[in-house]
């Protein structure tokens, strides 16, 4: 629950979010405090498709969501499933393909008047002082496709990594998701060794940048498993 995640003791002892983010290529956003907003990040091609086990939407690609493969199936067995296209049934926003959101159980186009809250704020913030908004909530009126495709800058609220500008990913921070920088060489990253091990983290870290992977720091090999420090290192 939100309460157990945010009040856990482990939260208080996390390293600071160097550069605002961290992670590894194996899962574009290192999963963290599973609090509120869904969105996919781990890209997979349709060709040669392998079911990818997941615990939440963040562990899947931008065109996928995390769910049980069979209706009413074992909730403990979840895989990344292809996103639902327009007019298909849905239960939450992450189930709908990019450019769509879930409204009244149906995936509808995001350029049809209503936007998911995070995308609304990203648009508002990207366009500066829109005096027709109040406290960062956009008017729920049609916005041009040009506006919709504006990428969120660092700190903007987002739904998926595709909402963020180049060099940023969409990652959780407390009760929200914001665009954070992709990690540079030497920065601390998070590597999860088992499904669901992210439950105690307070923020998500982005993946390591191009040509880098999240590996245990050489001088930490002797440390206990629980205290091993991972950093972004050259392949």
């Amino acid at each position: 629950t939100l309460n157990s995640v945010l009040n856990s003791n482990a939260i208080k002892n996390l390293p600071p979010p160097l550069g605002g983010a961290a992670g590894h290529p194996g899962s574009a956003v290192s999963a963290a405090p599973g609090i509120l907003y869904p969105g996919g990040n781990k890209y997979q091609t349709i060709d040669n498709y392998q079911p990818y086990p997941c615990a939440e939407d963040e562990e899947c690609g931008t065109d996928e969501y995390c769910a049980s493969p069979t209706r009413g199936g074992d909730a403990g067995v979840q895989i990344c499933l292809a996103c639902r296209k327009r007019r298909k049934r849905c239960m939450r926003h992450a189930m709908c393909c990019p450019g769509n959101y879930c409204k009244n159980g149906i995936c509808v186009s995001s350029d049809q008047n209503h936007f998911r809250g995070e995308i609304e704020e990203t648009i508002t913030e990207s366009f500066g002082n829109d005096h027709s908004t109040l406290d960062g909530y956009s008017r729920r009126t049609t916005l041009s496709s040009k506006m919709y495709h504006t990428k969120g800058q660092e700190g903007s609220v987002c739904l998926r990594s595709s909402d963020c500008a180049s060099g940023l990913c969409c990652a959780r921070h407390f009760w929200s998701k914001i665009c954070k920088p992709v990690l540079k060489e030497g920065q601390v990253c998070t590597k999860h060794r088992r499904k669901g091990s992210h439950g105690l983290e307070i923020f998500q870290r982005c993946y390591c940048g191009e040509g880098l992977s999240c590996r245990i720091q050489k001088d930490h090999h002797q440390a206990s498993n629980s205290s091993r420090l991972h950093t972004c290192q050259r392949h």
Epitope: L2, N3, L14, L36, G136, Y137, H173, F174
Partner: antibody
């Protein structure tokens, strides 16, 4: 237009129970988290806790945990802050704040709680 | 909890002056710093979030800078309506914590 309308000022005695409310309008209640912030007379702001109205999940500042309860009613788009037994030190202004980001964007006008014997 | 220390606790300036308020965190908070304005008897208003991003509808005379532990809030040209108490807030680590406030008055 996002609006957060808080309940009227309250005057209570120590040991009494109290529930104050924050009624929202102008946005989808379940899509934004609701926070409660305390401000004692002449003092700074203190974050008390947060609720996700979509599922009722809550998180509290350890300082307030066990002493207050945050809840939400989706049908009326209203959030609540309640005490089962007030203390004199609970006398303060209480604000609700609704947001999606790690900042507090929209605020209620505040509810002044006076506790005196 | 992370402690936020603002300075000065109060200051007096003239209309048109450049005003600077500083906020120091007890540990590194990266860019996770917000600034609020509170006028007497009113609720706080978000001015700046994520260290330097201007909130919607906020005049451009307000700005924020800094990183890590030391942050600065600036009003480039003080206006009469800017008389208020200003608070910094860290949102790097739970619980979010606020500075003690800086009361701004007109000379």
């Amino acid at each position: 237009e996002v609006q957060l309308l808080q309940s009227a000022a309250e005057v209570k005695r120590p040991g009494e129970s109290l529930r104050i409310s924050c009624k929202t309008s102008g946005y989808t209640f379940t899509e934004y988290t609701m926070h409660w912030v305390r401000q004692m007379p002449g003092k700074e702001l203190e974050w008390m806790g947060v609720i996700d109205p979509s599922n009722g999940d809550t998180s509290y500042n350890q300082k307030f945990k066990g002493h207050v309860t945050i809840s939400a009613d989706k049908s009326s788009s209203t959030a609540y802050l309640q005490w089962s037994s007030l203390k004199a030190s609970d006398a303060a202004m209480y604000y609700c704040s609704s947001t999606t980001g790690p900042w507090f964007a929209s605020w209620g006008q505040g509810t002044l709680v006076t506790v005196s014997s | 909890d992370i402690q936020m220390t603002q300075s000065p606790s109060s200051l007096s300036a003239s209309v048109g002056d450049r005003v600077t308020i500083t906020c120091r965190a007890s540990q590194d908070i990266s860019n996770y710093l917000n600034w609020y304005q509170q006028k007497p008897g009113k609720a706080p208003k978000l001015l700046i979030y994520y260290k330097s991003r201007l909130h919607s509808g906020v005049p451009s005379r307000f700005s924020g800078s800094g990183s890590g532990t030391d942050f600065t809030f600036t009003i480039s040209s003080l206006q009469p309506e800017d008389i208020a108490t200003y608070y910094c807030q860290q949102v790097h680590t739970l619980p979010p914590t606020f500075g003690q406030g800086t009361k701004l008055e007109i000379k």
